[in-house]
Each structure stands twice: as C-alpha cells, then as structure tokens.
C-alpha cells in the first residue's frame, strides 16, 4: 500500500491521543534504554510502511502484536485516514490468521514495540534530518 495520500496530521493526532498511551502500557516495566532502535524511516509514508510492517506482520519470536490494543487502533486510524487502505489488507490478514499464535509478551515483542515507538516518534517529526 502507498501511504502517500494519508491524512498525516489526523493520524499523528490519533497517535498522540491514544495509540502512544497503549504502546506505553504494553512496555510498562521495561526501561526506555533497554533496546536500541535499529529500524528507521525517512519520511511519513515510509514511516507508516515500517509501522504497518512491524505492527501487523508476524516475525520470528513475536507473532502476536496484531492482536494488541495499539494494533487495533493503528489499523482503525490507517483505515479511516488512508484512502483505500482497508481494501488492500484483505489478503495479508487472511494469510496472517493461519500463522497467528496466542498472545504472549516475549522479550522479542517488547523489542519490536520499542522499535515501533521509535518509528512513531520519527513519524511525528517529519522535518528532522535523518541521523
């Protein structure tokens, strides 16, 4: 999906108002310095591409993030403010359902959500030069 035509300011507002709080809740008990940010993004469409991938695509050691509250609200925001987004997700979700495991908060998942927090922070500051 091409995130170029999304309403970035509304997605940012939804992130600041509620999605960010859900990410913090997920990470509660974890030190903010515990994980290094290794995933980056260069502009807002790119950030959303990376956010979508980390949130909804199962990875080795962490197959469960798509069922978390922050993921549900992220999906809602992208569907509402990115034209045509919900129509593009059908095949991806169908494939994911077959692989999805029961919800377990592993260290790998915590690391992945830490990366997500970094991507969202970058999304919120699009004018900053890439480090």
């Amino acid at each position: 999906y091409d995130f170029t035509n999304c309403d970035f300011e509304k997605i940012k507002a939804a992130y600041l108002s509620t999605i960010s709080k859900d990410l913090i809740t997920y990470m509660s008990g974890t030190k903010s310095t515990e994980f290094n940010n290794t995933v980056s993004c260069s502009n807002r469409p790119h950030c959303l591409t990376e956010i979508q991938s980390l949130t909804f695509n199962p990875t080795a050691g962490c197959a469960s993030l798509a069922k978390e509250m922050f993921a549900m609200k992220t999906k809602a925001a992208l569907a509402i403010w990115c034209p045509g987004y919900s129509e593009t997700q059908i095949n991806a979700t169908q494939a994911m359902k077959k692989r999805r495991k029961r919800k377990v908060t592993t260290n790998k998942c915590l690391e992945q959500v830490s990366q997500l927090q970094g991507l969202w922070r970058r999304f919120n500051r699009p004018l900053l030069k890439q480090q």
Partner: antibody, heavy 121, light 108 residues
C-alpha cells in the same frame, strides 16, 4: 448521517442459535471496527467481540468460549453476530456499536437500536 | 481482565443538586481509554464523555469528567430532569473491553 439498523426481536429455544444483523449506512463500512454488546434485563453492558469488515479480523470476549461468531458482508454493509448453544441467561438486548475516533480518542461512537433475544422453552 | 466498579449503584438526588459518580478500575489505565455512556430506559447507550474529560457533541457543560490511573469521576454540577438515567464507564485499554455495572441517577 451514520445509522446502524438492527434486525427484529427473536424468540429462541434453549440449545438453538440466533443470528442478529446490523446494517450500516452513512460511512465507509469497511474502515471501522464493529462491536457487539449485550445487556441482560435490568443488568449492565457486556462486550462480546468485534470485527474489522475490511479484512474480517475479529476479537472476542473469551467468556463466550467459541459460542459467538461475528461476520460482516461488505457488499451489503451488514455485520452479523451469531450466538449458539443458547441458554436462558442469554436472554438480553444485543447492540451493535461502531468503534471510531472522536476528537482522536477511540470509543463506541454510534449504536444500533438493539435487538431483543428471548431464550425460552 | 480489567474490572470496572461503579459506585454508588443508585444515587438519589434532587433537581438542582450536584451528583458525583465514581468508577474504580482494577488496574491502572490511561485517561484516554476511559469513557462514559448514558442510557435511558428503552434506549440504546449514548456516548457521553470520551477519554475521561471530553464531552461528546451536544452534552451540556454541567457535566464534567476527571480522574487518572484507577479512579475516575463523572460530575453533574446541577441536575436537570433530563439527566436522570443510568451512566456506565467503560475501558478501551485491554481486551476484553469491559463496562462498569452502572450508576442509576434517580429523582429524590
């Protein structure tokens, strides 16, 4: 304007199933989570589950242990909630409620009128 | 699951008086995830307050919401006849979504 119109009242026998519909209009049906909430007579509200019509993803309240199935038909902008193995305690008003961002806070912003399901032998 | 406990179950108040409704949450949640709904007999619930303190569209300013963590409050500064109803708090912090048992505000 957003509207959620539910199917009519049902009377069912214990052990049978019921399927309640919720027809949505006035918004992009595929892009919003749809929730189902029930209310037994004189009781509070109980969340049953939700569906994202765009891709069919669902989340359920484990209390219903597989008795509830939520589906959606994008072609008719209709969500369905089916409850099986009915017992008398399932007698309730069943509501559909859209999940949406209001002032960028996420909540159930529009509700159907409710469908009364009576389970009686 | 997060348990929502509302108190009192019934509140008897005279028109013009102040009413304070409490919602206690079993584990700490973000204020953005706590909502209030109003329900009158024979009607569907209506969104009333979003995210602890943001009034839904058309809700009069005599209503206010506050709180954080595990304790939240809905306050009606001067009760009007149309305010007599049941009020439910609800959390959208973790699954399953849960509601409080409701507080019925009735005429004294």
């Amino acid at each position: 304007q957003v509207q959620l119109v539910q199917s009519g009242a049902e009377v069912k026998k214990p052990g049978s199933s019921v399927k309640v519909s919720c027809k949505a209009s006035g918004y992009a049906f595929s892009s919003y989570w749809m929730n189902w909430v029930r209310q037994a007579p004189g009781q509070g509200l109980e969340w049953m589950g939700q569906i994202f019509p765009g891709d069919g993803e669902t989340n359920y309240n484990g209390k219903f242990k597989g008795r509830v199935t939520i589906t959606a038909d994008k072609s008719t902008s209709t969500a369905y909630m089916e409850l099986s193995s009915l017992r008398s305690e399932d007698t309730a008003v069943y509501y559909c409620a859209r999940g949406g961002y209001v002032n960028f806070l996420y909540a159930m912003d529009y509700w159907g009128q409710g469908t009364t399901v009576t389970v009686s032998s | 699951e997060i348990v929502m406990t509302q108190s009192p179950a019934t509140l008897s108040v005279s028109p013009g008086e102040r009413a304070t409704l409490s919602c206690s949450v079993s584990s700490s949640i973000s204020s953005s995830n706590l909502h209030w709904y109003q329900q009158k007999p024979g009607q569907s619930p209506r969104p009333w307050i979003y995210g602890t303190s943001t009034l839904a569209s058309g809700i009069p300013a005599r209503f206010s919401g506050s709180g954080s963590g595990t304790e939240f409050t809905l306050t009606i500064s001067s009760l009007q006849s149309e305010d007599f109803a049941v009020y439910y708090c609800q959390q959208w912090s973790s699954y399953p979504l849960t509601f409080g048992g409701g507080t019925k505000v009735e005429i004294k």
